[in-house]
């Protein structure tokens, strides 16, 4: 005879496990059943009463088969400078990515927690490193032979036209102008981009320059206190 | 060690002014970039501002016009000075290097009449 399926409460063989979708409740010394993803144990199991689970209130979650008690918070919502990815259901959190131009500076589990606006090169500097989803651009100062007339996100800073008779020299921030003779260029003209995975920064907000000389560096400071806890909030 | 205290944070009413300070030891303001970061009650973390190393500064849409960020390099401080302040401007507000590594305490600014 097959052997007969236990139906939920009941004892588990000694040193066996509960199956699949199951818990092992301490406290009535049972094998019971786990609520599903978008619900929660409203009441749990007895040694004659399975646990009697409820669906998750507005702005609350359950990703995974679980016995908790109570569903868990979405994150707060999306800033201004955020995308939602994800929105909050039931069944999953509410996830949100930096918007187009920004990058993300500080991670969580899934998402961003906080973006920053990608940092613009001023004429006279250039991209050195490009900005990813995660990283600010870096700018450099365009060497000697080299100029960017742009304040860019993605412009590098590329060579000066080469002329027969130099009308204007070239400098950091200005091509060279030439006589009326046709100039012959080291790179085809035009702004030369980096490929990057996140787009230009918008006009969302605007530098406020000052003068600047030296090589943008990134900030590599060592670990140190966490940041501070996210903020939780409904809808 | 690194180390980023902020102060300056208080009660302010509508309107007022407020001027928070961010000591950074342990690290150099002429080749590090700070920001300021603001957690309303109850929000997510917002970004407000940064100035680079090369003191090139940004602002978010939010807070252009009212608040400036500016540095002492002597000091080695960095600073947000924040005027015609509203209710919304209400948190607590972090400075942090610009890689995120390492946070100040916090303080806390309300405004409200």
């Known amino acids: 005879l097959p052997a007969q399926v236990a139906f939920t409460p009941y004892a588990p063989e000694p040193g066996s496990t509960c199956r699949l979708r199951e818990y092992y409740d301490q406290t009535a010394q049972m094998c019971c059943s786990k609520c599903s993803p978008g619900q929660h144990a409203k009441v749990f199991c007895t040694k004659t009463s399975d646990t009697v689970c409820d669906s998750c209130e507005d702005s609350t979650y359950t990703q995974l088969w679980n016995w908790v008690p109570e569903c868990l918070s979405c994150g707060s919502r999306c800033s201004s400078d955020q995308v939602e990815t994800q929105a909050c259901t039931r069944e999953q959190n509410r996830i949100c990515t930096c918007r187009p131009g920004w990058y993300c500076a500080l991670s969580k589990q899934e998402g961003c927690r906080l973006c920053a606006p990608l940092r613009k090169c001023r004429p006279g500097f250039g991209v050195a490193r490009p900005g990813t989803e995660t990283s600010d651009v870096v700018c450099k100062p365009c060497a000697p032979g080299t100029f960017s007339n742009t304040t860019s996100s993605t412009d590098i800073c590329r060579p000066h036209q080469i002329c027969n008779v130099v009308a204007i020299p070239g400098n950091a921030s200005m091509d060279a102008v030439c006589t009326s003779t046709s100039p012959t260029r080291s790179m085809a003209p035009g702004a030369v981009h980096l490929p990057q995975p996140v787009s230009t920064r918008s006009q969302h907000t605007q530098p406020t320059p000052e003068p600047s000389t030296a090589p943008s560096t990134s900030f590599l400071l060592p670990m140190g206190p966490s940041p501070p806890a996210e903020g939780s909030t409904g809808d | 060690e690194v180390q980023l205290v902020e102060s300056g944070g208080g009660l302010v009413q509508p309107g007022g002014s407020l001027r928070l300070s961010c000591a950074v030891s342990g690290a150099s303001l002429s080749r590090n970039a700070i920001i300021w970061v603001r957690q309303a009650p109850g929000k997510g973390l917002e970004w407000v501002s940064t100035?680079?190393?090369?003191?090139?500064?940004y602002y978010a849409d939010s807070v252009k016009g009212r608040f400036t960020i500016s540095r002492d390099l002597a000091k080695n401080t960095v600073y947000l000075q924040m005027n015609s302040l509203r209710a919304e401007d209400t948190a607590v507000y972090y400075c942090?290097?610009?890689?995120?590594?390492?946070w100040g305490q916090g303080t806390q600014v309300t405004v409200s009449s």
């Open positions: 100035i680079y190393d090369d003191g090139e500064t």
């Open positions: 942090a290097g610009s890689a995120f590594d390492f």
